[in-house]
Amino acid sequence: FGDEEERRCDPIRISMCQNLGYNVTKMPNLVGHELQTDAELQLTTFTPLIQYGCSSQLQFFLCSVYVPMCTEKINIPIGPCGGMCLSVKRRCEPVLKEFGFAWPESLNCSKFPPQNDHNHMCMEGPGDEEVPLPHKTPIQPGEECHSVGTNSDQYIWVKRSLNCVLKCGYDAGLYS
């Protein structure tokens, strides 16, 4: 009966990881956190990357690592497949570098099973990576900064700070 106790799953209490296709997890997670609150605090550090919209699979991937899927049927947490990790890394690592940070060693894709099979269970992730991202994602570099108002041509989108800033000269009133 001890094993039955071990297998019990807990509801996911992290809001950004709710409604992602599964709703229970088991700690510790795949990066060693014992508590969901600790996992949640780490997850908040990825918000700029999620809002940037580098990969449609990023949020699901992160949740599958920090609150892996649990099932009463097997005693091990089910995390992401290596393929999803590589897909997310390929699209998001360049953006991470723009923020001045390296791809986390804790998300090293070689840690995850290459694919879901009877030997190693893992989650492949939702949908096709090539599907265009929803329009609600933030402005991408090169897009115009219409949100700042009438003088939008005086602004440029800066990746690192995730906002629109005045082009050189305008703040000094040279072109106004």
């Epitope: 809001s15 990066v31 600790d38 605090l41 908040t44 550090t45 700029p48 809002q51 986390p104 906002n163």
Partner: antibody
Framework: EVQLVESGGGLVQPGGSLRLSCAAS????????MSWVRQAPGKGLEWVSA????????YYAESVKGRFTISRDNSKNTLYLQMNSLRAEDTAVYYC?????????????WGQGTLVTVSS | DIQMTQSPSSLSASVGDRVTITCRAS??????LNWYQQKPGKAPKLLIY???SLQSGVPSRFSGSGSGTDFTLTISSLQPEDFATYYC?????????FGGGTKVEIK
Amino acid sequence: EVQLVESGGGLVQPGGSLRLSCAASGFTFTSYAMSWVRQAPGKGLEWVSAISGSGGSTYYAESVKGRFTISRDNSKNTLYLQMNSLRAEDTAVYYCARATGFGTVVFDYWGQGTLVTVSS
Amino acid sequence: DIQMTQSPSSLSASVGDRVTITCRASQSISSYLNWYQQKPGKAPKLLIYAASSLQSGVPSRFSGSGSGTDFTLTISSLQPEDFATYYCQQSYSTPLTFGGGTKVEIK
């Protein structure tokens, strides 16, 4: 340029209250978790509290739980720390800091700090 | 709570010296360890994150190593501007905790 400017510090009697503010600029405020870290005179750093970008999740050190409340107004790009039931041991310089790290919580930008003195 | 113990608490060194500061966690924290530099009257500055990654803009003479419970910050060749207090910080679990600091003084 990322800037964090704290205000609201001062002298307060034990048992009193104070509200600290931190005005943020130069980055998309809603994208980042924020934190308060304090430093008693001549002592080391002590983490006080943190809040997620949306404000939906908050975290506290045991020493301030139930007395301090962290909050943020994303429309004003401002972080707050409401401090109640203040004690002498709360005397410190309070720094607001941006929390980032992409999988490890680091404080990459800090304000200049505001001094809170609790004394009768 | 995870306790972070730094050693030494202070040290004297000369310009050009190789300086090593250690930080020990009371339990395993994997690589969730960051290093900061603080000068008198100033806010701390991030140097190293995730045990060994150099923060953007920080000189390469600073390096970090370690995993689990034992970590090291090394300054390969001490410069005049490096005289300061150095803190380690764990971000493995809340409450986030800092080491007591190591003051690097001029010999």
